[in-house]
């Protein structure tokens, strides 16, 4: 029996479902009998979900584990993992038997979106060209860590004077604060750009500072 | 700075109500989950209630149909309302960041005793 | 009785490597992440390791945290006298839907 899986990870957005595709070719007269299935976690071997002995054993994993019953006699051998969370990433590994055994392993990739950046500004008024001020740039429940980029309003990157920090909630969802510091010059726009390195998705932010009334 | 500052802890009977509060200062309150845990008396810690920033609510089985948490963006302030109150809620109680509280207040103490 | 198994007591000398352990079940522990504090004779706790394995700003690297299946362990190495305290872990319980700590582990330096 040759077990086939997709190469590229599969990516799942958090509280989503995601699908871990296994497939096998079953020989004429194959019956759901003859089937040993077993999906376990590559590194620690930690049994998710199986299928033996006729029946579906259910899930080893937190409840959250399905097969796909009706398509099992046609060789479909996916895994699906239920309102996916941080601590599902990793490498899972689907063991076919029938009467010899392949395995193969699949990477499931966890992401979540960042919110739209919120930009503040200390001091927030009296501003004067050649004051030093702090623009802190935050965004939120992203996944996994996220990198962040300045610029300025002529889209030059500015990389000095930049702190980043990001903190994590109980479910592994971080929180970014990036902290700029810069000497005002008469007008200027300062972006800042939350970038999701596996979604490559981007969330922008940016004040504006003039003589008027500051624009985000 | 990042500060908690949690009030309104007090003395009060078996069957009492009280409410506590906890004034968040130095991050931007409404973005963030928050809770509440307890340490009774030369106990450990345990988890009472938690609030997630879009306010979806959780509590320990413990405190379940008699304490309420809640929250006033608009105050930055996060509350925990206390009813029917037993001797064994009597503790320390503290506000913090998250569930995973990355930051805690000072606490503040209820006493439950006639 | 905590869901979260800890040993109540731990001991070790200055300079030595002492191990609290932390053990739960497949609801917490097994798929969640697992969080350490230290709490210091008459102060609030602190978190001390997140995410399992991650230390806050200003945690020395002698505190370190790890996870295989479902137990969790908090190692601290090079021990110092001013690490004389109480030391919890906590995750998050599926079957409960709610934060859980550890019964807490008290450590002394002899």
């Known amino acids: 029996v040759e077990v086939q899986v997709s190469e590229d990870p599969v990516v799942a957005l958090v509280d989503t479902d995601a699908t871990l595709r296994c497939s096998f070719s079953p020989e004429p007269g194959f019956s759901l009998a003859q089937l040993n299935l077993i999906w376990q976690l590559t590194d620690t071997k930690q049994l998710v979900h199986s299928f033996t002995e006729g029946r579906d054993q259910g899930s080893a994993y937190s409840n959250r584990t399905a097969l796909f019953p009706d398509l099992l006699v046609q060789g479909n051998a996916s895994l699906r993992l239920q309102r996916v969370r941080v601590t599902d990433e990793g490498s899972y590994t689907c063991f076919v038997s029938i009467q010899d055994f392949d395995s193969a392993a699949v990477s499931l990739q966890v992401a979540a979106p960042y919110s739209k950046p919120s930009m503040t500004l200390e001091p927030n008024k009296d501003l004067r060209p050649g004051n030093m001020v702090t623009i802190t740039c935050s965004s939120y429940q992203g996944y996994p860590e996220a990198e962040v980029f300045w610029k300025d309003g002529q889209g030059v990157p500015l990389t000095g004077n930049v702190t980043t920090s990001q903190m994590a909630n109980e479910r592994g969802l971080f929180d970014v604060h990036s902290v700029l510091r810069v000497v005002l010059g008469a007008n200027g726009t300062y972006s800042c750009l939350v970038r999701n390195p596996v979604l490559q998705q981007d969330a922008h932010g940016s004040v504006t500072i003039t003589g008027q009334p500051l624009t985000f | 700075e990042v500060q908690l500052l949690e009030s309104g802890g007090g003395l009060v009977q078996p069957g009492g109500s009280l409410r506590l509060s906890c004034a968040a200062s130095g991050f931007s309150f409404s973005n963030y989950d928050m809770s509440w845990v307890r340490q009774a008396p030369g106990k450990g810690l345990e988890w009472v209630a938690g609030i997630r920033s879009g306010s979806r609510t959780y509590y320990a089985d413990s405190v379940k149909g008699r304490f309420t948490i809640s929250r006033d963006n608009s105050k930055n302030t996060l509350y925990l309302q206390m009813n029917s109150l037993r001797a064994e809620d009597t503790a320390t109680y503290y506000c913090g960041r998250y569930f995973n509280m990355d930051v805690w207040g000072q606490g503040t103490t209820v006493t439950v005793s006639s | 009785q905590s869901v979260l198994t800890q040993p109540p007591s731990a001991s070790g000398t200055p300079g030595q490597r002492v191990t609290i352990s932390c053990s739960g079940s497949t609801f917490n522990i097994g798929t969640n992440l697992v969080h350490w504090y230290q709490q210091l004779p008459g102060t609030a706790p602190k978190l001390l390791i997140y995410?399992?394995?991650r230390r806050p700003s200003g945690v020395p690297d002698r505190f370190s945290g790890s996870k295989s299946g479902t137990s969790a362990s908090l190692a601290i190495s090079g021990l110092q006298s001013e690490d004389e305290a109480n030391y919890y872990c906590a995750t998050w319980d599926d079957s409960l839907n709610s934060f859980l700590f550890g019964g807490g582990t008290k450590l002394t330096v002899l």
């Open positions: 995410l399992t394995d």
